[in-house]
């Protein structure tokens, strides 16, 4: 048969951050090509990345149609130059991915502090509301649009002159914190989805400190 040297894909892995979702697998192809199919549990299979020599396939466009659905993908292996060929059972060799539910599993990307503004002894710290590739009514939704109150942010802040840290939480994208007048502070934020059991926290944002460009000061 023409499939003698065709091997099934293995180590199928979902890589997803802020809903940008790529399926990766092994091995690097030798004399074979791959096609990926994706479906929801109850839906039809849709083919993507036809006859590719890549070992990854961007499935973002499919999963953003409904991020709360659970998806399954499969990777078909075909002999290079003979993609009509089938395996001994009469169909191409393929391997299933683990199930993937974007809303519950996509990694939270590193957040960014958009700005901070001091007014007297209060500082308002604003977290950038990152745009995702999830669409509604032809517009891209932000992370907050998608997750709503399921998404919180944790702020870490400390005086530039000391190591003692404080923390605050918000269910919006803004913090209003008390500071000592005349002191400079540094800030870092982290995104959290407390209801999750996996991929609950993002990495910390880059640290931003008062006395640098992002801030504004008013008496």
């Amino acid at each position: 048969s023409g499939t003698t040297n065709t091997v099934a894909a293995y180590n199928l892995t979902w890589k997803s951050t802020n809903f940008k979702t790529i399926l990766e697998w092994e091995p690097k192809p030798v004399n074979q090509v791959y096609t990926v199919q994706i479906s929801t549990k109850s839906g039809d299979w849709k083919s993507k990345c036809f006859y590719t020599t890549d070992t990854e396939c961007d499935l973002t466009d499919e999963i953003v149609k409904d991020v709360k659905q659970t998806y399954l993908a499969r990777v078909f292996s075909y002999p290079a130059g003979n993609v009509e060929s089938t395996g001994s059972a009469g169909e191409p060799l393929y391997e299933n991915s683990p199930e993937f539910t974007p809303y519950l599993e996509t990694n939270l990307g590193q957040p960014t502090i958009q700005s901070f503004e001091q007014v007297g002894t209060k500082v308002n710290v604003t977290v950038e509301d990152e745009r995702t590739l999830v669409r509604r009514n032809n517009t891209f939704l932000s992370l907050r649009d998608v997750f709503g109150k399921d998404l919180i942010y944790t702020l870490y802040y400390w005086k530039s002159s000391s190591s003692g840290k404080k923390t605050a939480k918000t269910n919006t994208n803004e913090f209003l914190i008390d500071v000592d007048k005349g002191e400079n502070y540094c800030f870092s934020v982290q995104a959290v989805i407390p209801s999750r059991t996996v991929n609950r926290k993002s990495t910390d944002s880059p640290v931003e400190c008062m006395g640098q460009e992002k801030g504004e000061f008013r008496e």
Epitope: T167, A168, K169, T170, T172, V192, R200, T203, D204
Partner: antibody, heavy 117, light 107 residues
């Protein structure tokens, strides 16, 4: 299932230090925040401080700042609290607790620390 | 620092009574408030998280309400096993602060 197992009761002399451990199972401490709470006999609950094991950030109540150090060892999935310069008013039960972001949802059984000469 | 004022400090009620405990924060804590039940010699147990959500395995007679600075724990029909001390906790900002506790007894 989720469990927090604290180290055993300690009798310590005034002026010395004590280090209590809290071994987590059923979850990865890096995915949560870990806190320590003090309860003196017959009294209410008092937050000592907390730690984010993923990045090492630790926060303390100013009342304890300088005397307490909260750390975590992600390789053993264990949180620690060290309290130094012990005095009689440190005699208490010390609880570790997991913070999900919404609440301290799981607590250790408590470690009794008795400070006496 | 945020102060949490919990009231009453103790109460006595009959089995089947509706019991209400309140916590008032000195500033907006954005629903980062949880309620705990503690029985003698035991660790605190989570009842309510995020101000209004019932924790797993907690009887439905317990409920939480409130937002901003004012929060309430309600036991709709007091049962003998509810004899305990109840605490609120704000964790919206460090230092985290507990209310002073409410000791609930049966008449």
């Amino acid at each position: 299932q989720v469990q927090l197992l604290e180290s055993g009761a300690v009798l310590a002399r005034p002026g010395t230090s004590v280090k209590i451990s809290c071994k987590a199972s059923g979850f990865n401490i890096k995915d949560y925040y870990m806190h320590w709470v003090k309860q003196r006999p017959g009294q209410g609950l008092e937050w000592i401080g907390g730690n984010d094991p993923a990045n090492g950030h630790s926060m303390y109540d100013p009342k304890f700042q300088g005397r307490v150090t909260i750390t975590a060892d992600t390789s053993t999935n264990t949180a620690y609290m060290e309290l130094s310069s012990l005095r009689s008013e440190d005699t208490a039960i010390y609880y570790c607790a997991r913070d999900s972001g919404y609440a301290m949802d799981y607590w250790g059984q408590g470690t009794l620390v008795t400070v006496s000469s | 620092d945020i102060q949490m004022t919990q009231s009453p400090s103790s109460l006595s009620a009959s089995v089947g009574d509706r019991v209400t405990i309140t916590c008032k924060a000195s500033q907006d804590i954005k629903s980062f408030l949880s309620w705990y039940q503690q029985k003698p010699g035991k660790a605190p147990k989570l009842l309510i998280y995020y101000a209004t959500s019932l924790a797993d395995g907690v009887p439905s007679r317990f409920s939480g309400s409130g937002s901003g600075t004012d929060y309430t724990l309600t036991i709709s029909s007091l049962q003998p096993e509810d004899i305990a001390t109840y605490y609120c906790l704000q964790h919206g900002e460090s230092p985290y602060t507990f209310g002073g506790g409410t000791k609930v007894e049966i008449k």
